[in-house]
């Protein structure tokens, strides 16, 4: 259900690797975009 937007991710980053480094504001933005699925906060309904 999660779409991986490869153009926004570097070096085949995974959800786990992103969530492990949620420190900077840019990390959060990348995370929310990664989770886009059906919405910015993530996941299909």
């Amino acid at each position: 259900k999660h779409k991986c937007f490869r153009n926004s991710l570097e070096n085949n980053e995974t959800l786990e690797s992103i969530m492990n480094t949620l420190e900077s504001e840019e990390d959060f933005r990348k995370y929310f975009y990664y989770l886009e699925g059906s919405k910015g906060g993530g996941g299909s309904k």
């Epitope: 929310f32 906060g41 996941g43």
Partner: antibody, heavy 114, light 113 residues
């Protein structure tokens, strides 16, 4: 379907603490974080902070630093928000929400009164 | 912190007419890496939690009537209700999730004229 179910209303005295729970279902709990947002009577929405259900990392609003603690229990897919040293102006409806706010709990009224 | 300022504070619109709510952020919420605006709109009715209407500034949430639309980019955003219905009476909030703390506008109350 995604659901966030919160604990019931609380009445507390000034100086006391309150702990509100938020049980999540319908999604992979550890893939998301939980925000807490409060709303004083007749007022707008105030973001209190966020916790990662993946590793427990937190990001608190500066105004509440030192008084608020957010935790999660992945075994029960439940998030908790504890607020200490309660004051009358902490009287509000407290909401949990997934990440920045795509799904919300029903709210928990916390009344602080002597 | 990013300040979110909504206008007007309240709005009275006749049934079937257009309602327009503006939201201005104190700094841009457009992320250049993905060209997304980290801006959401919510509807809140008395005694209920906020309900997500719009995210990414212009993407309508599943199940939200198409009379609701969002537009704008950078610092200036608009929520439009193209034809106001009785059930649309509520308070509407914008929120940025570009930078913590994720802040909300002060709210706009929409009523029937």
């Amino acid at each position: 379907q995604v659901q966030l179910v919160q604990s019931g209303a609380e009445v507390k005295k000034p100086g006391a603490s309150v702990k509100v729970s938020c049980k999540a279902s319908g999604y992979t709990f550890t893939s998301y974080g939980v925000s807490w947002v409060r709303q004083a009577p007749g007022q707008g929405l105030e973001w209190m902070g966020w916790i990662s259900a993946y590793n427990g990392n937190t990001n608190y609003a500066q105004k509440l630093q030192g008084r608020v603690t957010m935790t999660t229990d992945t075994s029960t897919s439940t998030a908790y928000m504890e607020l200490t040293s309660l004051r009358s102006d902490d009287t509000a409806v407290y909401y949990c929400a997934r990440n920045w706010g795509d799904y919300w709990g029903q709210g928990t009224l916390v009344t602080v009164s002597s | 912190d990013i300040q979110m300022t909504q206008s007007p504070d309240s709005l009275a619109v006749s049934l079937g007419e257009r309602a327009t709510i503006n939201c201005k952020s104190s700094q841009s919420v457009l992320y250049s890496s993905n060209n997304k605006n980290y801006l959401a709109w919510y509807q809140q009715k008395p005694g209920q939690p906020p309900k997500l209407l719009i995210y990414w500034a212009s993407t309508r949430e599943s199940g939200v009537p198409d009379r609701f639309s969002g537009s704008g980019s950078g610092t200036d955003f608009t929520l439009t209700i193209s034809s106001l219905q009785a059930e649309d009476v509520a308070v509407y909030y914008c929120q940025q999730y570009y930078s913590t703390p994720w802040t909300f506008g002060q709210g706009t109350k929409v009523e029937i004229k």
